[in-house]
Interface confidence: medium
């Protein structure tokens, strides 16, 4: 599936790239999937298409939805989908999980934190950087091009880092912020806030009624076998064992697997004989350890027997 999740905050700029790539000479048409309505290309519109890019200048919560892009060439058409979610600005400092970009790790030798998605924007230096909502100050922090360099990295440098920059479009300025977690690698082994590798946040899993379905919750917790780490599934906020549906079971035996030296755990949710009512449930993949809990939500949707995607 050529589908990509994108997210942003209301009143900030958001630029989304079509998940289907093509030559610059190919035309790209954008549509709002729910209505099949074409997205205009005129820059006077708040939301407009510009080749492979879809621009929200600025974004509004109501812009949330699935957008279709069709890359057209003389010989073929390629279709992609951009799942866009615009969130209200948080009043407090806490950046919710669903606004976080991928976690990056650093060590004494390498401590670059790249500002996520910045390459899509027309921005000028300098970038502003914040850690846990506090502006970074001191000679250890150096904003360099599109990344932050931290000198003499310590374990205390782990946290959530936000980059803030200005996107310029035809003389108008729009603010953009992006946040990602930074963890500090210790060659001795370390423990970190859980990072869920699968499923993606708010993933839609297509299933066939009457067939069996499997959902895998996979998360990493640090380096070395981790004590007090677990992954599990919940249905509508209830433990699987307490939910009382024998068709839906967790597969026990969370053996620790090591990917890139990281300690990771898997938990498979098996749904036998998928029923209509299963589509109404909220499936939460939970990963927890001493540092805290991370949750990714999955919903099921009915798979059409014949899919006409080009």
């Amino acid at each position: 599936k050529f589908s990509k999740q994108s997210w942003g905050l209301e009143n900030e700029a958001l630029i989304v790239r079509c998940p289907r790539q093509g030559k610059p000479s190919y035309t790209v048409d954008w549509y709002y999937s729910q209505t099949n309505k074409s997205i205009p290309t005129q820059e006077r519109n708040r939301v407009f298409a510009s080749g492979q890019l879809l621009k929200f200048l600025p974004a509004a919560v109501a812009d949330s939805g699935i957008y279709t892009c069709i890359v057209r060439s003389p010989t073929f058409n390629r279709t992609g989908y951009a799942n866009v979610t615009i969130y209200k600005k948080q009043s407090d400092c806490n950046v919710p999980d669903y606004l976080m970009y991928s976690t990056v790790s650093g060590s004494e030798k390498n401590s670059k934190i790249y500002c996520p998605t910045i390459d899509l924007y027309n921005w000028t230096a300098p970038l502003e950087w914040f850690k846990n909502c506090q502006a970074l100050q001191g000679s250890r922090y150096r904003a360099h091009k599109s990344f932050l360099v931290i000198d003499n990295v310590m374990t205390e440098d782990a946290g959530d880092y936000t980059c803030k920059f200005i996107h310029n479009e035809n003389g108008a300025n729009y603010s953009v912020t992006a946040t990602r977690s930074f963890t500090v690698k210790d060659e001795q082994g370390f423990s970190l806030f859980p990072v869920i590798g699968a499923p993606a946040q708010n993933e839609i899993k297509e299933v066939e009624i009457g067939k069996n379905a499997n959902l895998t919750c996979s998360a990493c917790f640090g380096k070395g076998t981790q004590f007090l780490a677990a992954v599990l599934w919940q249905l509508n906020g209830t433990k699987i064992t307490d939910f009382g549906e024998p068709r839906i079971q967790q597969e026990e035996g969370q053996n620790q697997s090591f990917s890139n030296g990281l300690a990771c755990l898997d938990m498979v949710l098996r749904i036998a004989d998928v029923k209509e009512e299963d589509l109404l449930l909220q499936y939460d993949c939970l990963a927890l350890n001493l540092h805290g809990l991370r949750r990714h939500t999955v919903r099921l949707s009915r798979k059409n027997p014949i899919d006409h995607h080009s």
């Epitope: 210790d186 082994g189 423990s191 070395g224 004590f227 927890l288 001493l290 540092h291």
Partner: antibody
Framework: EVQLLESGGGLVQPGGSLRLSCAAS????????MSWVRQAPGKGLEWVSA????????YYADSVKGRFTISRDNSKNTLYLQMNSLRAEDTAVYYC??????????????WGQGTLVTVSS | DIQMTQSPSSLSASVGDRVTITCKAS??????LTWYQQKPGKAPKLLIY???KRPSGVPSRFSGSGSGTDFTLTISSLQPEDFATYYC????????FGQGTKVEIK
């Protein structure tokens, strides 16, 4: 001041059951993993079980798996250990311990005074 | 499970002495090592965590070092209140404790 107060220990016959409680005060109970550690008379320390903040995940030593159940009631700031099918080798002082948060693994930073469980016929 | 072996199992020392207790893990445990002090009839007390970190309230004469499989607890100048049993514990995997080292008055 952090305080942990265990209760529920006593003499029980092999095969019997006992429920230990640990009343916590002086800290935000729901923010911490909690654990039980035991110490047989004149012996060293043995980790028994642990539970996550909201009780979603539980962990057990192989020696007690299937016989002991750890649980918690955050509204009452209380940790429990339900012990079934008790054996003579379960005789020990049982300590309730708080697990500190941090990237350096699970250290038990505060301990209760312990409650003695004696399994004997 | 990872086995933790302490040495010596007991030692006699005088006030003011420098005391060293070692703890060896059967497998690599990184820095996930903790030391506790226990006095007779009392609960254990956290002394050192994360191999070398001291909680507030623990005197600076207590220090920890080592990494991987070999660790050391050092008391730079033994005080009367330090006569007790000391345990190491790993939490790299399911927690296990050393058998203890009893520090007695010479």
């Amino acid at each position: 001041e952090v305080q942990l107060l265990e209760s529920g220990g006593g003499l029980v016959q092999p095969g019997g059951s006992l429920r230990l409680s640990c009343a916590a005060s002086g800290f935000t109970f729901s923010s911490y993993f909690m654990s039980w550690v035991r110490q047989a008379p004149g012996k060293g320390l043995e980790w028994v079980s642990a539970i996550s903040r909201e009780g979603r995940a539980t962990y057990y030593a192989d020696s007690v798996k299937g016989r002991f159940t750890i649980s918690r009631d955050n509204s009452k700031n209380t940790l429990y250990l339900q012990m079934n099918s008790l054996r003579a080798e379960d005789t020990a002082v049982y300590y309730c311990a708080r697990i500190r948060v941090g990237p350096s693994g699970g250290a038990f930073d505060y301990w209760g005074q312990g409650t003695l469980v004696t399994v004997s016929s | 499970d990872i086995q933790m072996t302490q040495s010596p199992s007991s030692l006699s020392a005088s006030v003011g002495d420098r005391v060293t207790i070692t703890c060896k893990a059967s497998d690599h445990i990184g820095k996930f090592l903790t030391w506790y002090q226990q006095k007779p009839g009392k609960a254990p007390k956290l002394l050192i965590y994360g191999r070398n970190k001291r909680p507030s309230g623990v005197p600076s004469r207590f220090s920890g070092s080592g990494s991987g499989t070999d660790f050391t607890l050092t008391i730079s100048s033994l005080q009367p209140e330090d006569f007790a049993t000391y345990y190491c514990q790993q939490s790299y995997s399911t927690p296990t404790f050393g058998q203890g080292t009893k520090v007695e008055i010479k």
